[in-house]
């Protein structure tokens, strides 16, 4: 199934998307939808670029903050609510036959967690978990197959982003 | 709400070019979604043939490619299907049909080629 | 092409019955996978999406299922306006391939 990224409401949500431009600047129309992506196109767009910039946005909580221009497309969800919670498309509109690349991303929204962490379990969940976690200031994610990710359960995640919050994180599971 | 209607000539005969028009009402078609035909064959197969995008951009079924070509009038909110030196193998019902998953279909066009 | 094998060509059934049509692609689609009915001398329609994701409007009496390679449409309760023809579509790679249909009558 999709890969899952988990983010707090109230804070960033980061989803990772990237092509690589061939050649170097030859950037391609790409489009973020709501919703597992359909046949064509994007479902209830929430942001499209065409080959030079952004230029469709439905709300100013949709970002793309990463270097756009070499390809990292990776949307960034201002300020989540619980009704930001679902499957997200973000489709790489390559010309040719057909060649668009598609890839749906989860994310689930999660209220704030009310345990207080111990003050050393961020340093030794990141240290055991070390992909999980993307923020809005990364590039994309190193590309994974969704059963490459460390088992982690969901007390583990809900007192993970308790530790987060202020940093705007987003975690990523299978 | 999105609507489209097919028209055709209903018969053709062998080798000459078949022109399909689609008709699209309560949506521009440079606004959005892949403007689309289909076929569906007698024995009810259906076939996608081709589609052109609301920027213009087409792209063709392979096993059609040297055959077909899909065009639109934007200023009478029209798309066109061209199949050059038919066979009595297209004979078939044509659909024109939009939408992300194509949610919207016109009521199809049945086409025979007969000499 | 990505070959849809969809079974059975037909099948009949009853009124209340649960029935069960499948879609096997020559290889993996990833789930891009959607179910479309069609009644007599009516273009398709759009059922579902994404294996699961039911097109609006549709009763929850349809369900999708699977992955990998194969799929299936369940239909529980059978009503009489459910007799018609089904199609499954991949929209893994182009160009689209149809399954060769699956029509349901009434037994």
């Known amino acids: 199934s999709e890969v899952e990224y988990i983010a707090e409401v109230g804070q960033n949500a980061y989803l990772p998307c990237s092509y690589t431009p061939a050649p170097p600047g030859n950037l391609v129309p790409v489009c973020w939808g709501k919703g597992a992506c359909p046949v064509f196109d994007c479902s209830n767009v929430v942001l499209r670029t065409d080959n030079r910039d952004v230029n469709d946005r439905t709300s100013g909580r949709y970002w793309l903050k990463g270097d756009f221009h070499k390809g990292d497309v990776s949307l960034t969800i201002e300020n989540v609510t619980l009704a930001d919670s679902g499957v997200y498309c973000c489709r790489i509109q390559i010309p040719g036959i057909m060649n668009d690349e598609k890839h749906n991303v989860k994310l689930v929204v999660i209220k704030p967690a009310k345990v207080t962490p111990a003050p050393t379990l961020q340093r030794d969940l990141t240290s055991a978990f070390p992909r999980m976690l993307t923020t809005g200031e990364h590039g994309p994610a190193e590309t994974q197959t969704p059963g490459s990710l460390p088992d982690v359960n969901l007390t583990q995640i809900f007192t993970l982003t308790n530790e987060l919050r202020d940093s705007g994180a987003t975690i990523r599971t299978a | 709400d999105v609507q489209l209607q097919e028209s055709g000539p209903g018969l053709v005969k062998p080798s000459q070019s078949l022109s399909l028009t689609c008709t699209v009402t309560?949506?521009?078609?440079?606004?959005?979604?892949?403007w689309n035909w289909i076929r569906q064959f007698p024995g009810n197969k259906l076939e996608w043939m081709g589609y052109i995008n609301y920027s213009g951009r087409t792209s063709y079924n392979p096993s059609l490619k040297s055959r077909i070509s899909i065009t639109r009038d934007t200023s009478k909110n029209q798309f066109f299907l061209q199949l050059n030196s038919v066979t009595t193998e297209d004979t078939a019902t044509y659909y024109c049909?939009?939408?992300?998953?194509?949610?919207?279909w016109g009521q199809g066009t049945t086409l025979t080629v007969s000499s | 092409d990505i070959v849809m094998t969809q079974s059975p060509s037909s099948m009949s059934a009853s009124l209340g019955d649960r029935i069960t049509i499948t879609c096997q692609a020559t290889q993996d689609i990833v789930k891009n996978l959607n179910w479309y009915q069609q009644k007599p001398g009516k273009p398709p329609s759009f059922l579902i999406h994404y294996v699961t994701e039911l097109a609006e409007g549709v009763p929850s009496r349809f369900s999708g299922s699977g992955s990998g390679s194969d799929y299936s449409l369940t239909i529980s309760n059978l009503e009489s306006e459910d007799f018609a023809d089904y199609y499954c579509?991949?929209?893994?790679?182009?160009?689209?391939?149809f399954g060769a249909g699956t029509k349901l009558e009434l037994k």
């Open positions: 309560g949506y521009s078609i440079t606004s959005d979604y892949a």
């Open positions: 579509l991949q929209f893994y790679e182009f160009p689209l391939t």
């Open positions: 049909t939009s939408g992300g998953n194509f949610d919207y």
